[in-house]
């Protein structure tokens, strides 16, 4: 903590300017008023301060504002942005895309997906819901960001914006966020043509459930096999090997690459052999022939 | 064949929460997005929300702070709890299944339970 | 939300007769409607869906038609099993939408 000294008359200061860079921490701290760092913060980002000067001012700014920034604030970080934490950022009410834009510029570069992440949440808050406008600014200046959303906060996002999700935005998305994200598409893009459709739903496919997948299979969409290794395990071994080989076309030949990946491994362990062996690709853990298949989980649930 | 049923108290007071099960047989749930919908007596059909198998849910928002959908797949059902219910939420109560295919792409009901009376009242 | 208004409330036909139904849509729904019937103390059967698909078991005597927002429901020869309230429901948009039913009776 930097600690309290009294202003020398000559070093007062009565606006940010460059001159402020000859200062000690101490002489910051001391000369600097609060209140006239908040309102000229559009200035200190083009001064050339020390990480050490930034976090005299982030600690000048923190006293003034213990319940969180104002937007006016926030909005004029800078690179002072880089010296907030995600607890900070938690306090702030941001609505400004303007604000999101500047504040992902600066931490472009920096190991800051905490912070980012927090901040894109605080903006969701904020607005209210994952609108259009904050999906493209996403999109354009933090790419993989929506995926740092949690599912509750995805939610938000009304069908009609699904359309300016781009497939790389949802590379780094796991099973509970697509979970959220799949039948928003499906609503989406309900309206277009099989091969149109599958092009638009295939980035949210991991949150699919098996009875959409089977319907796939009789559209001869023939899935790629990274595609086919995200979608849920449970959605995956409910499916014959028919409707796998109908699924993925000519793709079938991948499965013998993925033989001991999941969901692969444990849908071989599902089929009889006998089926595997109709596809010619030598996989292998299939059920043997004259065994009997008890699916307990089943009987359980009728019990 | 796949058949669902709906269990709960059909007498609740005002205030307080009105909780439903519904339990699917003969299938499972995973595969299938799974809702409920209310009609109040001599009235219209109204849609609360659906849940997948993984617990992901979305509710009407007329609704919405007071609703919780949650499931049990190790159980193979899935619940509903309306907090501070009125007169205004006495209706049959059903359990419905989204047809859930993209071949015919859409989300509507293909599968109802019988439906349960709840009745709310002090 | 897409407010969905049946018309009539209530519609008297003689059995053999011809029943038309209809179900317009606050905006476009394009062709994301279903049709239901529902009998006294049953739950609502899917009848129609995408307009004019029937479902699974469904008689060739009920034909779905219209699209954007206009629908209607036709029963081209009414059998005695048919009297029951008819219900539109779209799904182009959450929260999904259920018209306030349509009674039809025995003239």
């Known amino acids: 903590d930097v600690e309290r000294t009294t202003c020398p008359p000559e070093k007062e200061v009565h606006e940010i300017d460059e001159s402020l860079i000859f200062y000690k921490k101490r002489e910051l701290e001391a000369c600097v008023d609060a209140a006239l760092l908040a309102a000229q913060m559009d200035r200190v980002d083009a001064i050339p301060f020390t990480y050490e000067q930034l976090d005299v001012l982030k600690h000048k700014l923190d006293e003034l504002y213990p319940q969180g920034y104002p937007e006016s604030v926030i909005r004029h970080l800078g690179h002072l942005f880089l010296k907030m934490s995600p607890e900070d950022i938690r306090k702030w009410n941001v609505t400004s895309l303007e604000t999101l834009k500047a504040l992902l510029k600066v931490s472009k570069g920096h190991e800051m997906s905490a912070q980012v992440a927090t901040l894109i949440d605080r903006v969701v808050v904020g607005r209210g819901q994952l609108d259009k406008d904050t999906v493209d600014t996403l999109t354009a200046f933090c790419p993989g960001c929506l995926c740092s959303l949690s599912p509750e906060r995805l939610s938000s996002v009304p069908p009609s914006v699904i359309g300016a999700v781009r497939p790389q935005d949802l590379d780094t998305c796991g099973p509970r966020q697509l979970d959220v994200l799949y039948p928003k598409a499906r609503l989406a893009f309900q309206n277009m043509s099989g091969s149109e459709y599958f092009v638009k739903i295939r980035p949210f496919l991991g949150g699919a459930p098996t009875e959409d997948v089977k319907a796939l299979s009789q559209q001869n969409v023939s899935m790629d096999l990274a595609t086919f290794m995200k979608l849920r395990r449970e959605a995956v071994l409910p499916l014959t090997v028919a409707e796998v080989q109908k699924l993925l076309g000519p793709h079938v030949e991948g499965l013998k690459v993925e033989e001991q990946h999941s969901p692969v491994r444990d849908w071989i362990l599902k089929q009889r052999q006998d089926d595997l062996d109709t596809l010619g690709l030598g996989l292998q853990g299939g059920i043997p022939n004259g065994y009997l298949i008890l699916d307990l989980s089943v009987r359980e649930a009728l019990s | 064949q796949v058949q669902l049923q709906e269990s709960g108290p059909g007498l609740v007071k005002p205030s307080e929460t009105l909780s439903l099960t519904c339990t699917v047989s003969?299938?499972?749930?995973?595969?299938?997005?799974w809702s409920w919908v209310r009609q109040p007596p001599g009235k219209g059909l109204e849609w609360i929300g659906y849940?997948?198998?993984?617990?992901?849910?979305n509710s009407n928002p007329s609704l919405k702070s007071r609703v919780i959908i949650s499931v049990d797949t190790s159980k193979n059902q899935f619940s509903l709890k309306l907090s501070s219910v009125t007169a205004a939420d006495t209706a049959v109560y059903y359990c419905?299944?989204?047809?859930?295919?993209?071949?015919?792409?859409?989300?509507?009901?293909?599968?109802w339970g019988r439906g349960t009376l709840v009745t709310v009242s002090s | 939300e897409i407010v969905m208004t049946q018309s009539p409330a209530t519609l008297s036909v003689s059995p053999g007769e011809r029943a038309t139904l209809s179900c317009r849509a606050s905006?476009?729904?394009?062709?994301?409607l279903a049709w239901y019937q529902q009998k006294p103390g049953q739950a609502p059967r899917l009848l129609i869906y995408g307009a004019s698909t029937r479902a699974t078991g469904i008689p060739a005597r009920f034909s779905g038609s219209g699209s954007g927002t206009e629908f209607t429901l036709t029963i081209s020869s009414l059998q005695s099993e048919d009297f029951a309230v008819y219900y539109c429901?779209?799904?182009?948009?959450?929260?999904?939408?259920f018209g306030q039913g349509t009674r039809l009776e025995i003239k």
């Open positions: 849940i997948f198998y993984s617990g992901s849910t």
């Open positions: 419905a299944r989204e047809v859930g295919r993209i071949a015919v792409a859409g989300w509507f009901f293909d599968l």
């Open positions: 905006q476009s729904v394009q062709s994301n």
């Open positions: 429901q779209q799904y182009n948009n959450w929260p999904l939408t």
């Open positions: 003969g299938g499972s749930i995973n595969n299938y997005y």
